[in-house]
């Protein structure tokens, strides 16, 4: 987590956290782009969705993602302030019934069709970082973030808190 403790220190916190209720706090549509202003796009290929990181042509429409925000308990054994320690998690859905999933075995980010309640792999802890950039940390694998690798989204392990500001795990959300 961002500027949070060393990666190992909060491992148990995310695994132990429970999402309070099944209804999101709020939901809204936004386009997702990288720190370097490349767009995250989604394409249907061979009956499955592929995720790309690319420069859009002028006036080309950006793909939108439905972000659903959930509040989750941040366990007292980590935060030290009992029931008051909380964090925000998000799910990201670019099209109906499909959600971004963390595939920790393959270190990949995939779009899976699934029904609610969503699996833990679809939840990401939200971090505000550099100015108005955000980062997405896997609920199922603390210290692992959605990042950009070879023009694709991938899961990137952040080995120490000093590397948390690395640009390839920073994203911009835009509602326009």
């Amino acid at each position: 987590a961002f500027g949070i403790s060393g990666v190992q220190k909060y491992t148990r916190a995310l695994h132990d956290s429970s999402i309070t209720g099944i209804s999101p706090i709020t939901e809204y549509l936004a386009s997702l782009s990288t720190y370097n202003d490349q767009s995250i796009t989604f394409a249907l290929e061979d009956e499955s969705y592929e995720i790309y990181v690319e420069d859009l042509k002028k006036d080309e429409k950006k793909d939108k993602v439905l972000l659903s925000y959930y509040e989750s308990q941040h366990p007292s054994n980590e935060s030290g302030d009992g029931v008051d320690g909380k964090m925000l998690m998000v799910t990201l859905s670019p099209t109906k019934d499909f959600w971004l999933h963390a595939n920790n075995k393959e270190h990949s980010v995939e779009l899976h069709k699934c029904e609610k309640p969503l699996p833990d792999q679809a939840f990401f802890v939200l971090h505000n970082m550099h100015s108005n950039c955000v980062s997405f940390e896997c609920k199922t694998d603390p210290g692992v973030f959605i990042g950009v690798k070879d023009n694709h989204l991938a899961l990137i392990k952040v080995d120490s808190s000093e590397n948390l500001c690395t640009e390839n795990i920073l994203f911009k959300l835009s509602e326009t």
Epitope: G3, I4, S5, K9, E78, K86, M87, V125, V134, E162
Partner: antibody, heavy 122, light 107 residues
Framework: EVQLVQSGAEVKKPGASVKVSCKAS????????INWVRQAPGQGLEWIGR????????SYNELFKDRVTITRDTSTSTAYLELSSLRSEDTAVYYC???????????????WGQGTLVTVSS | DIQMTQSPSSLSASVGDRVTITCHAS??????LSWYQQKPGKAPKLLIY???TLHTGVPSRFSGSGSGTDFTLTISSLQPEDFATYYC?????????FGQGTKVEIK
């Protein structure tokens, strides 16, 4: 109990620098961003910037970027605000404040220090 | 930057009155709005976060509502200890910004 305890009042001359400290206790210091907010006499609240104690990463309000340095010492669970090239309009109470949410600023500031009055006068 | 506009800037009320303070954001901030209470010589205290959620230990006479650009803080029955200045603050984007404050005075 979460506590943020700040250093004492300071009187400085124009052009000087000041460094205010904020010692955190009652929670894991590296788990929440610390923000700095100031309030000029009889005025409203103005956000200066924030630091992630675990990584030392900082985000500043552009209005203050050139004159402000925010640092931390994890061994003492202390955050610092240094303001340089002081002018009379920097006279204010400076507060440190811990964010409500782990990792993000959406939930505002759950806990505040008692404030440090910085007076800039020749 | 997102501008936050509070109204009124001050109001006079009596103990037991229902008090309403409004806050307008210059752009959509969804539910990412917090309300604070500040008494003279003291630090602000978080009352409400996420537009309508009461912070730990805050009396239930305080309530918040709204989303998008328009928000309201309501004190259902004003108590002597509620005379203070109230600030709204947006948490949608950096730089984080506050309203100019509403001073609630004794009539």
């Amino acid at each position: 109990e979460v506590q943020l305890v700040q250093s004492g009042a300071e009187v400085k001359k124009p052009g000087a620098s000041v460094k205010v400290s904020c010692k955190a206790s009652g929670y894991t210091f590296t788990s929440y961003w610390i923000n700095w907010v100031r309030q000029a006499p009889g005025q409203g609240l103005e956000w200066i910037g924030r630091i992630a104690p675990g990584s030392g990463f900082i985000s500043y309000n552009e209005l203050f970027k050139d004159r402000v340095t925010i640092t931390r010492d994890t061994s003492t669970s202390t955050a610092y605000l240094e303001l340089s090239s002081l002018r009379s309009e920097d006279t204010a109470v400076y507060y440190c404040a811990r964010e409500f949410y782990y990792g993000s600023f959406y939930g505002g500031f759950a806990y505040w220090g008692q404030g440090t009055l910085v007076t800039v006068s020749s | 930057d997102i501008q936050m506009t509070q109204s009124p800037s001050s109001l006079s009320a009596s103990v037991g009155d229902r008090v309403t303070i409004t806050c307008h954001a210059s752009q959509n901030i969804h539910v990412w709005l917090s309300w604070y209470q500040q008494k003279p010589g003291k630090a602000p205290k978080l009352l409400i976060y996420k537009a309508s959620t009461l912070h730990t230990g805050v009396p239930s006479r305080f309530s918040g509502s709204g989303s998008g650009t328009d928000f309201t803080l309501t004190i259902s029955s004003l108590q002597p200890e509620d005379f203070a200045t109230y600030y709204c603050q947006q948490g949608q984007s950096s730089p984080l910004t506050f309203g100019q404050g509403t001073k609630v005075e004794i009539k």
